[in-house]
Each structure stands twice: as C-alpha cells, then as structure tokens.
Interface confidence: low
C-alpha cells in the first residue's frame, strides 16, 4: 500500500494520516476500516466498491458534510458506521436508505439541529444510535414507528427541553436498554412520554437541572414502565422526601444513581418505594443527617456507595454530619458498602445493625475521631458476615482487646496508614477465626510479643512495612504461630537484630520482604556466634527481597533450603565477592537482582547455577573488572542467553582495568581467554 495505513487481520488502520481521500490500494478483504482523524470532506461511494466486505467503517473526526446514499449500496455487509465529529447538518430519508444491516450508527458531535421525515426508518437492525453532542432541540427522530431493535439511544449534550409522547412514539415497538438524555435542558416531561416507548429499561439524566420538584414528576411519568436503571447524577436534587420517588413504586428499578447532587436532606421513607433496588450510588453528596428511616424500604440493595456523602460544613464540631442508629437496618441484602472519605464523628453502637449480608465495608478516611478501637466499636457488625474491612487513613492510634471479636467471618483487615503505636498482646485479634490477611503497614510503632499473633493461626498474609517494629528478635518468635503464612512483609523497619528462629515453622512462606532494614551484621563471619541463618527451612519461598540492607557478605549456606526460590532481590547492598556454591540449590530461580552492589567478578562457579533457568537478570551499576578471570564466562553467557537483561548496553560497564573503564561489558573480547565457554 502506498498509503501508510497499517493492516492486520483484515483490519485497516488509516487514522491520523492527513488523508483527503479514501485509499484505493488496501486489501479488498478488509472488514474493518479506520479513517478517523483525517481531512476527508466526502465519502464517494465509488471509492468503496473494492471494500465490499467491510462490516465496520469509522470516519470520525473528519470534515464530512454530506453522505452519498449509494455508500451503503457498495457496503452491503456494513454493521457499524461511525461519523462522529464531522460536519453533517442534514439527514434526508435517502441518507441511510441502503444501510439496512447497520447495528451501530454514531453521529455524535455533528451539527444536526433537526431530524426531518424518517432518515432511520430502514435501520431495522440498529441497536445503537448515537446523536449526542448535536444541536437537537427535541427527541423527534421520525414520524412513524421504526427502529424496533434499537437498544441504545444516545441524545446527551443536545438542546432538548421537553420529552413528549408524540415524539417518542416512534419507539412504540422498541425495547430501549439505554435512553441517554444527560446534559440537556429538560424542563418538562409531558404525560405519557415514557409510555410511548415500547419498553424502557435505562434512563440517564445526569447533568440535568431537575431539582426535587421535576424529579418527582419524572418518577410519576416512569410509573408502570419497565425502567430498571435510572441515573440522576448532578441533577440538583438537594432534598428528598417520601414523595420524591413515589412514582417508582410501580416499577422494578434495580439501579439508582444520585451521586454529585449536593444532596442535603434525605427525608424518612424517601426510598420506601424502591424494594427492588440493588445498586444505589449516593457518592459525593452533602448529607447532614441520615435519619433512622431515610433508607427504609431498600430491602434488596446489594451495593451502596456513600463515598464523600457526609462532609462537614465548617470547622465547628456542631456541624458534623449525623447518622442515626439503625439507619442501615433496612438493607438486609447489602453486601458492599463504601463509606470512604467522609467526616462522620464516630461509630455508634447500632450504626451498622441489621446488615446481615454485608461482606465488604470500606471505612477508609471516614471518621473525624476514631482514635481508639474498643471492644464496642464494631458491635453493630456482630451479625454481619463481613469478609473485608478497610480502616485505613483514620488516625487510629490504639486497638484495644477484642476490638474485632465480633467479626468472626473477616478475611481481610486493613489497618494501614494510621497512627497505631502500641504493644500487640494478641488479644486485639481475638475472634478473627477466619482471618486471611492483616495489613498493618505504615503505622507509628508496633512492639511484638510472643503472643502477638497467637490467636490468628489461619493468617496467610501479614504486612508490617514501616511500622518501627520492636522486639522482632524475641524468642520464641512472634511469628511462630503463623504456620499458614504465605506472605510476610517486614520491610522498611530498620531491623538490625533478629534470631535464626524468627521465621521458624513458616514452611508455607512464599513471599518474604525484608528490604530497607539493617541486617548486614547478621551475615558477617565476624558476628559473635557466627552468621545467623534466619532463612533456614523456608522450603517453599518463591520471592525474597533483601534490597538495601548493607550486606557486604553472604554466608555460603544461607540459601541452602530455598529450593523453590524464583525471585531474589539483593540490589543496593555492598556485596563484592560471593561464595562459590551460594546459589547451588536455586534451580528454579527466574529473576536475580544484584544491581548497585560492588561486584567485580561474575564467575561460573558462583553464578552458573543461578543463571541456569533465569528469565530476568539485573546486575546494573556494578564495577565490573573486565579481565578474563573475572568476566569472560559472564560475557559469553550474556551473548548466548535468552535471559532478559535490561539496559545491558548502557548500564553494564567496565570499571577496571583503567583502559577498559566505561567500556560495555558485553563487548569485551573473550576470544583470547581460555576455558570461558558458558555452556558445556
């Protein structure tokens, strides 16, 4: 092809090529043609004769002002036609007369201000019609019943002011899954306007200034329709009462979006008419008081989003939002509750009472004063089968005994990014019989005891990153009870002292993070009593991170038991010489990181076993000694391996001898070296 189109699998991409005409030299069997973002003014039908197999044609973002009716005659198999962002202003009855197989027609962002006659009458298979971002002043798209298979009608960002039954009755035989009318200036819903449509399942009226009064009228018009999904985001619905949604009593609404409404007052029984509702979006509102009956009637809601719904009006404590006890008791089917980023004063004793199906609860950054978690804090969740609880970013400083004793089903507890500073006696976790993960990273300080985790033997993941961990060197180890542990993160704690039994019994451990500590002394031969083999027995370890620990020595048998190690990170240490058989048992090693150490020599007797099955190697920024003895074997291995070695050309440079300083290691000439073959 002389044009710069890319063709792959019968798809031709000719976008962004400044084309002024349709290419005439593409393969004739293409089924998809993308001509977007060019300078096409017209689409001569004759130019498409050779592309009769097209099922999808996208000519968006051009300057097309007119369409030849014959175009579709040349494209009998066309299903998707995208004309968005062009300059179409008039559609005649002939425009799409031959486009009988279309399932999608995209006309958004043109200059269509009025639809005359019946330009879409032949589109019996059309599923999606997008007329958004035009200048339409009404929903009138024809004068006779048509578009019986239409499922999505997108009319957002137009100038529609009223919905009238006589304009919508062309959809008398249609089942609309989505009627998108967002960002219009609708001020009127004439009687029967929605009943004119055969079946209406989804109505989207976001960014329409409805207010409480017009919302009420809207809902009355929706009575006895098939409506399932209703979206009224940013519709200036500042208050709701027990009549606002009355009309929806005669529907089976399952989704309601009231987000971004600055909703201030939610009156009792506001939603009593919505017993079928399953998904309720209330995020980004301004509710000042949730009454005990505000949510009454929502017996089937499974998902409720209250993120940033309760925010304080001023710095005064008196202005904090209130949530009455038992406010959620009606939500018997609720499984997922998001209450992130709020200004709720605290958790009352019956705040969550009645949520008998709740599985996921996010309370991240939700409270103004949740400094201490007591044995009463979560009593209202005693009968909830909670699996995941997120308590991050709440400035929690203390967890008292039995704080979670009510949460016997809990699997994931996230307490990260708080200000917890205390000794962990072990009583904090009492009752967490099914706990799988406790995330405690990024807290003030944690002092461990031998019983810190004695009551949670089911724990599989424990995250203790940057918590100024104290007493980790006690014996028996605080981790001894955690026989099921698979992931342990002890990084960023400046740990300097640990015993060789710290990880004793953790035979299922798979991931161990110890980066950014101060463990160098433990592996020195001069250490009183000799090196400390704290990795012994971890026969199932897959990933080991020991980066940034100041190591300048590695004992020969330190990795002896780590038969299944796949990834090891020893980067940013001070390692120079490694003992000959240090990696002999790492037959499964896939990734080795030794970047930014002081390694000068890469010899077969040390690295041969480790390199055998490697898929990734990182030894950048080491001061390699480019002599036969030091790197001949390495260079030959580099040049024959399939292992991924990022930045090999630029960051593997010789340091010595002086005449090789700065020279790329891989270019070192090994031909004069003896016995340097990497493979035998």
């Amino acid at each position: 092809s002389t044009t710069k189109c890319t063709v792959s699998h019968e798809v031709a991409d000719c976008s962004h090529l400044k084309l002024t005409q349709v290419p005439d030299d593409l393969p004739t069997n293409i089924t998809v043609l993308n001509l977007t973002h060019n300078q096409l003014r017209r689409l001569p039908a004759a130019n498409f004769t050779r592309y009769s197999q097209l099922t999808s044609l996208d000519v968006g973002f051009n300057t097309i002002s007119k369409l030849e009716p014959e175009l579709c005659q040349k494209l009998p198999m066309l299903k998707v036609l995208n004309l968005q962002h062009n300059e179409l202003s008039q559609l005649s009855d002939k425009t799409f007369a031959f486009c009988t197989n279309l399932t999608e027609l995209h006309l958004m962002s043109n200059s269509i201000q009025k639809i005359k006659n019946n330009p879409f009458v032949k589109q019996k298979n059309l599923i999606t019609l997008d007329l958004s971002h035009n200048g339409l002043s009404s929903t009138k798209l024809g004068t006779q019943v048509q578009l019986e298979n239409l499922q999505e009608l997108l009319l957002s960002n137009n100038k529609i002011q009223a919905l009238k039954s006589e304009e919508l009755d062309i959809f008398a035989n249609s089942s609309l899954k989505k009627l998108e009318l967002s960002s219009n200036q609708i001020k009127e819903f004439s009687p029967g306007c929605f009943h004119a449509i055969g079946r209406l399942f989804g109505l989207f009226l976001n960014n329409v200034q409805l207010g409480p009064s017009l919302t009420e009228k809207l809902c009355l018009e929706l009575a006895n329709t098939s409506i399932r999904n209703l979206s009224l985001s940013n519709s200036q619905l500042s208050t709701t009462s027990n009549t606002t949604f009355l009309g929806l009593k005669w529907t089976n609404l399952t989704m309601l979006d009231l987000s971004y409404n600055n909703l201030n007052v939610v009156g009792n029984d506001s939603f009593a008419w919505l017993p079928q509702l399953e998904y309720f979006f209330l995020e980004y509102n301004n509710i000042q008081h949730l009454f005990s009956h505000s949510l009454h009637g929502l017996f089937n809601v499974r998902y409720l989003n209250l993120k940033r719904s309760f925010t304080k009006q001023s710095i005064s404590l008196a202005s904090l939002p209130k949530i009455d006890d038992f406010s959620f008791q009606w939500l018997k089917c609720l499984e997922h509750l998001n209450m992130e980023d709020n200004d709720i004063p605290g958790i009352k004793s019956n705040m969550f009472t009645g949520l008998i199906n709740l599985k996921y609860l996010s309370l991240s950054n939700s409270f103004t004063s949740l400094r201490t978690l007591t044995n009463e804090t979560f009593v209202s969740l005693a009968h909830s089968p909670l699996h995941i609880l997120n308590l991050t970013k709440n400035k929690i400083s203390k967890i008292e005994s039995d704080a979670f004793s009510w949460l016997g089903h809990l699997e994931v507890l996230d307490l990260g990014l708080n200000e917890i500073g205390q000794e962990l006696t072990g009583q904090e976790w009492r009752g967490l019989e099914n706990i799988f993960e406790i995330y405690l990273s990024y807290n003030k300080y944690l002092q461990l005891t031998r019983n810190s985790f004695a009551l949670v033997p089911s724990l599989q993941r424990l995250m203790l990153r940057r918590v100024a961990l104290k007493n980790v060197d006690s014996s028996p180890s605080p981790f001894q009870p955690l026989r099921n542990l698979t992931i342990l993160d002890l990084s960023n704690n400046n740990i300097a002292n640990i015993n060789d039994d710290m990880l004793e019994g953790l035979e299922k451990l798979e991931i161990l993070d110890l980066q950014h500590n101060n463990l160098a002394r433990l592996w020195k031969h001069a250490n009183p009593g000799g090196p400390i083999y704290f990795l012994k027995g971890l026969s199932h370890l897959h990933i080991l991170n020991l980066e940034s620990n100041g190591f300048d020595e590695i004992p020969v048998e330190v990795f002896k038991d780590l038969f299944e190690l796949k990834i090891i990170d020893l980067g940013l240490n001070n390692l120079n010489t490694l003992p000959a058989s240090v990696f002999n048992n790492q037959v499964s090693l896939k990734s080795l990181n030794l970047q930014k150490n002081l390694i000068t020599s890469v010899e077969k007797k040390v690295f041969g076993p480790a390199f055998r099955n490697l898929t990734e190697l990182d030894m950048r920024f080491n001061p390699f000694d480019c002599t036969c003895e030091s790197i001949a074997w390495f260079v030959n291995w580099i040049n024959e391996t399939h292992t991924n070695i990022p930045e090999l050309s630029s960051h593997y440079l010789c340091n010595t001898p002086p005449h090789y300083h700065g020279f790329p290691v891989r270019l070192f000439d090994t031909s004069s070296c003896k016995d340097s073959a990497p493979f035998e």
Partner: antibody, heavy 119, light 107 residues
C-alpha cells in the same frame, strides 16, 4: 509427582446426594487447599469452593453453600465433595484441583468425575 | 462477586496466526489471573498465572499481560495443538470465577 485421582462416574436420581472423592499423592496432603470446580456439558467452568485439608476450613461459592459439603480424611489423603438435593442441572463433570506453592493458580487437576442426574 | 468477561466467545484462526484473547474483570483483581487451556474430555491445563508468568512446561509462544481489570492472553504463532477452549480465572477473592471461555477453532 503431584496426582489427584477422583472416584468414578455416578448416576443419581433428582433429590439424591452424590459424594465425589479426590485422592492426593506426591505431596503432603495437608499443605495445600483443595478446590472443587464443575463443568456442565458444553458449558464453562464454575468454582464451587475450597477446603483446607489441614484444618477443614471451607470457603463455598454462595451459589452452592446450602447444598454442598466439603470434607477430608487426612489419614488417607482424600478430599470429598458432597452435593445434596440434586437437580438435573447438576449434571456435570466435577473436578478437584490444587493450588501451587504460588497460591494464585490451579496447576494440578483431577481427571474429573461425571455425575449424571436423571430420573 | 467479581465477574470475568472473556472475548471473543469463539475465534477462527489458522496455524501460524497471532491470536489475542481478552479477559475483563468487573473489579480490580490486581494481577491474580490465570489462563487455562482445555481440550474435549480433559481437565483444564494451566498456561499462565499471576497474569503473565508462564507455567512450567508451557511453550513460550504463550504470553499473558495486564493488571487491574484488563488482561490478555496472546499466542504468537498458533500450532495445531493449540486449538482448544481457553479460560481465564481470577484469584482475588472468593468465588474464584472463570471467564465463560473462548473456543479457538481452525479456520
């Protein structure tokens, strides 16, 4: 090598129960969770639940919670999955599977047990 | 529950073709995604785990990518033995749902 050997095919009447066994060998039985997955004829895979042979802890798919019972006998390294109140749409091949050391995958599967529910 | 949506549901291709199958999760599953190959009358066989790690013994023409909610299985050059049904499965939280499957057929 790791092997999961399941019991033979079963034909059951509606309303009855079926108990499928899965005998493990080649590794320490108590070390890894056993999962149960079923596949109706011509259909996709459906995860039913998992059991920890070490302590018998179970996570069921809510869909099966009221009818499925997963048990194990560590003395013979065998896991069991019992499905009660059988219906015709329970006709399927039932597989047991085991996680790897990396707990986010099923590298090991039984050969499958065909359970036919028919009156 | 997290739903897994696979596309396409079926796919015709020829030996030597490059094939891509996608899997979308209804929520964030990080990289806890596995891909399996299943042939008629056989148990599924693990291909990829943790979104992109090749299982032992699996040919390097198979590769996985993605994280969060969108994942891809790619077969760089189809071989005759690759015609089968492929499933994705997440391991983020129970239930560990599978995608509905993609049947890869010979064109």
């Amino acid at each position: 090598q790791v092997q999961l050997v399941q019991s033979g095919a079963e034909v059951k009447k509606p309303g009855a129960s079926v108990k499928v066994s899965c005998k493990a060998s080649g590794y320490t039985f108590t070390t890894y969770w056993i999962h149960w997955v079923r596949q109706a004829p011509g259909q996709g895979l459906e995860w039913m639940g998992e059991i920890n042979p070490n302590n018998g802890r179970i996570n069921y798919n809510e869909k099966f919670k009221t009818r499925v019972t997963m048990t194990r006998d560590t003395s013979i390294s065998t896991a069991y999955m019992e499905l009660s109140r059988l219906r015709s749409d329970d006709t399927a091949v039932y597989y047991c599977a085991r996680v790897g050391v990396m707990i986010t995958t099923f590298p090991y599967w039984g050969q499958g047990t065909l359970v036919t529910v028919s009156s | 529950d997290i739903q897994m949506t696979q596309s396409p549901s079926s796919l015709s291709a020829s030996v030597g073709d490059r094939v891509t199958i996608t899997c979308r999760a209804s929520g964030n599953i990080h990289n806890y995604l596995a891909w399996y190959q299943q042939k008629p009358g056989k148990a599924p066989k693990l291909l990829i785990y943790n979104a992109k790690t090749l299982a032992d013994g699996v040919p390097s023409r198979f590769s996985g990518s993605g994280s969060g909610t969108d994942f891809t299985l790619t077969i760089s050059s189809l071989q005759p033995e690759d015609f089968a049904t492929y499933y994705c499965q997440h391991f983020w939280s129970t239930p560990f749902t599978f995608g509905q499957g993609t049947k890869l057929e010979i064109k």
